[in-house]
Interface confidence: low
């Protein structure tokens, strides 16, 4: 057996492909439940058939388990800006995203928001909004590039990075960054 | 799952002061500008304040520049927002908020704290 694997996956193993090990007799191996289908009761014994059921409304498998009971499906957080591409059936998860001209900004790994492209608004798009990724801007002379806006060299100060692009502007510049409001 | 939890507010008299934290947790905390948001009794949401992921930039509303301060601790993982010569008009729900970059939208969680500034 493969070390570090759960009990289960252990169990697993002992059987052939696409079967699971009886949890009460590790001497018989039963066929696993197909997707969109879950374990209601064990094979009665070698070469018998397990006790597969059509999960819910509500609820999915995406794979052939022995699970005894269905995922819950997923709902796409309207909070987040999420909107649903694709419902939740038997065998597949709701798939969510993100409408036109957005890009999905991920919190954490299952968690992601919605937030429109850049238009690059004083410069232009060095690479375009894809799917996980906000436009990418190269901004025009006079501007710099800070937190993916193309800000005037005027609201430059010395102590920033922006100084080497802003280089022949920054001599004349007044420290105005403390006073920004919506 | 992002987590931000408020506290530090209650009851003060106009004039007095209030300090309030935000524990972050859940997403890499040194990575984003965080700021505050109100939302006034029966009002909508009003921007406060922001600082910039490492605390180089700070932005305020007009409404409070000058008595509030805006402050982070990225080793605790932690935003505050020190609250002085606090007004009747002051009292709101303050939430913590995570921005993407200093226009996106902000988001936020938890019950947030209120404040209330009244004699």
């Known amino acids: 057996l493969v070390p570090h694997l759960g009990d289960r996956e252990k169990r697993d193993s002992v059987c052939p492909q696409g079967k699971y090990i009886h949890p009460q007799n590790n001497s018989i191996c039963c066929t696993k439940c197909h997707k969109g289908t879950y374990l209601y009761n064990d094979c009665p014994g070698p070469g018998q058939d397990t006790d597969c059921r059509e999960c819910e409304s509500g609820s999915f498998t995406a794979s052939e388990n022995h699970l005894r009971h269905c995922l819950s499906c997923s709902k796409c957080r309207k909070e987040m800006g999420q909107v649903e591409i694709s419902s939740c059936t038997v065998d597949r998860d709701t798939v969510c995203g993100c409408r036109k001209n957005q890009y999905r900004h991920y919190w954490s790994e299952n968690l992601f928001q919605c937030f429109n492209c850049s238009l690059c608004l004083n410069g232009t798009v060095h690479l375009s909004c894809q799917e996980k990724q906000n436009t990418v801007c190269t901004c025009h002379a006079g501007f710099f590039l800070r937190e993916n806006e193309c800000v005037s060299c005027s609201n430059c100060k010395k102590s920033l990075e922006c100084t080497k692009l802003c280089l022949p502007q920054i001599e004349n510049v007044k420290g105005t960054e403390d006073s920004g409001t919506t | 799952e992002v987590q931000l939890l408020e506290s530090g507010g209650g009851l003060v008299q106009p004039g007095g002061s209030l300090r309030l934290s935000c524990a972050a947790s859940g997403f890499t905390f040194v990575k984003y500008s965080m700021g505050w948001v109100r939302q006034a009794p029966g009002k909508g949401l009003e921007w406060v304040s922001q600082i910039s992921n490492t605390a180089d930039r700070t932005y305020y509303a007009h409404s409070v520049k000058g008595r509030f301060t805006i402050s982070r601790d990225n080793s605790k993982n932690t935003l505050y927002l020190q609250m002085n010569s606090l007004r009747a008009e002051d009292t709101a729900v303050y939430y913590c908020?995570?921005?993407?970059?200093?226009?996106?939208?902000?988001?936020?969680w938890g019950q947030g704290t209120l404040v209330t500034v009244s004699s």
């Open positions: 908020a995570v921005y993407t970059g200093r226009w996106e939208p902000f988001v936020y």
